[in-house]
């Protein structure tokens, strides 16, 4: 995260990062207690899943191995569409006040709308800086007209944009797959943005969560 | 430091296939995309295709698509390109590229590898 | 596919001169275009990005401006160290990445 802050401790409990070993990978947010939703772009073989910490790395966290993902079937590698996946954890999580389900959205938050969108991806841009605390970013919900002014095609149409004007707030490497939460709701997932980051007027741009929710509950119902 | 380097040149015979390497150093080889750029003798450069190193997603040049075979090694931090049936018009100098940008999307090339001759001659 | 054109294949000049090399593309690309040089036997290195980001490290005499279809890279003030070829390439519509034909600029 460019220009955040340190998230309040357990905040966030349904953030996770996915690891690769002892790397941070991605993000993701935990919506059942043995499923993890990302970014399709985040598909590894297999994932070491970290909960209930906010350090990256804590020996007290939950650690869950994970070897089946399930990426939408309409993702492309080519326009980016659809870049949304299901992780299943091979055993289920122990909840608890530091690991909790997200609140997936009952409806789409119109533009305007406050977030906060975090991670544990680097807080400089082009030269990396990983933080080891769990970092906050919020935005703003910006409208997909004014965001094609600045993507033009490349903004699909199950795409959200998010950011603050003139600030150069934003997500970056390692954010990819985490949460944006909105009125307590996950409404989306990082997906891209321009490089470096932080570009003020560069928005975030998200996998609007709000338009996969028949498709997460049913590919959750088919794999239990 | 931060590099990719390739491994050394090649003499192939027409029909034959050719493997080339590129080894990342100095980064997180897992976090970014390696791509595949060529330049025939006296000529320009041409994208070839791409690998993520994470997911091993792979998009290739049409008019490689089905010669061309991109993988990679995360123990090692490599990549490999492979074309097979090899003509005489596939001799050039093949260059591995680092893809900069965050999640989904990248932009630019902004690490290359000192690049890998490959000749091919009967 | 994406067809960008580079103008002129090559041009010579002297040390001191004001140098400018076009791209075009068949259709918009935003900004999404990016300036490399290449000397013989070397890899091709990155100038500017976005059309108009100057890469860390490179001299500010190397400038891009452009937007949509048509782009410029300008050296404002040619050095014996920029006697190379250039390149544009696209990263609007991808895959593929396209490149445009390459400008040698040669000493006059």
């Known amino acids: 995260i460019i220009d955040g802050y340190k998230c309040k401790e357990g905040s966030h409990p349904w953030q996770v990062a996915l690891l690769k070993g002892n790397q941070l990978h991605c993000g993701g947010v935990l919506v059942d207690k043995y499923w993890v939703l990302t970014a399709a772009h985040c598909k590894m073989g297999q994932y070491q899943v970290q909960l209930g910490s906010d350090k990256i790395g804590d020996q007290s966290a939950q650690k869950i191995k994970a070897t089946k993902s399930f990426r939408h079937p309409g993702y492309s590698t080519k326009t980016h569409v659809n870049d949304i996946m299901l992780v299943r954890l091979d055993e289920p999580v122990k909840m608890s006040s530091k690991v909790e389900a997200v609140q997936l959205p009952e409806h789409c938050e119109p533009p305007g709308t406050s977030c906060t969108v975090s991670g544990w991806g680097t807080t400089t841009s082009p030269d990396v800086t990983f933080p080891s605390d769990l970092m906050c970013s919020d935005v703003k919900l910006i409208s997909s007209r004014e965001c094609k002014k600045v993507y033009k095609d490349l903004l699909g149409k199950t795409m959200l944009c998010a950011g603050i004007p003139d600030s150069k707030t934003n997500t970056c490497n390692g954010d990819s797959g985490g949460p944006l939460v909105c009125n307590d709701t996950l409404q989306g997932l990082v997906s891209w943005g321009t490089y470096p980051c932080g570009q003020p007027n560069d928005p975030g741009v998200y996998t609007q969560v709000c338009k996969y929710k028949r498709w997460v509950m049913e590919t959750m119902k088919t794999h239990r | 430091q931060v590099q990719l380097v390739q491994s050394g040149a090649e003499v192939k015979k027409p029909g034959a296939s050719v493997k080339v390497s590129c080894k990342a150093s100095?980064?997180?080889?897992?976090?970014?995309?390696i791509h595949w750029v060529r330049q025939a003798p006296g000529q320009g450069l041409e994208w070839m295709g791409s690998i993520s190193a994470s997911s091993g997603d792979t998009n290739y040049a049409q008019k490689l698509q089905g010669r061309v075979t991109m993988t990679t090694d995360t123990s090692t931090s490599t990549a490999y390109m492979e074309l097979r049936s090899l003509r005489s018009d596939d001799t050039a100098v093949y260059y591995c590229?680092?893809?900069?940008?965050?999640?989904?999307?990248?932009?630019?090339?902004?690490?290359w590898g000192q690049g890998t001759m490959v000749t091919v001659s009967s | 596919d994406i067809q960008m054109t580079q103008s002129p294949s090559s041009l010579s000049a002297s040390v001191g001169d004001r140098v400018t090399i076009t791209c075009r593309a068949s259709?918009?690309?935003?900004?999404?275009l990016n300036w490399y040089q290449q000397k013989p036997g070397k890899a091709p290195k990155l100038l500017i990005y976005?059309?108009?980001s100057l890469q860390s490290g490179v001299p500010s005499r190397f400038s891009g401006s452009g937007s949509g279809t048509d782009f410029t890279l300008t050296i404002s003030s040619l050095q014996p160290e920029d006697f190379a070829t250039y390149y544009c390439?696209?990263?609007?519509?991808?895959?593929?990445?396209?490149f445009g034909g390459g400008t040698k600029v040669e000493i006059k």
């Open positions: 100095g980064y997180t080889f897992t976090s970014e995309g």
């Open positions: 390439d696209q990263w609007y519509s991808t895959p593929p990445i396209t």
């Open positions: 976005g059309a108009s």
């Open positions: 259709q918009s690309i935003s900004s999404y």
């Open positions: 590229a680092r893809a900069a940008g965050y999640g989904a999307r990248h932009w630019y090339f902004d690490l």
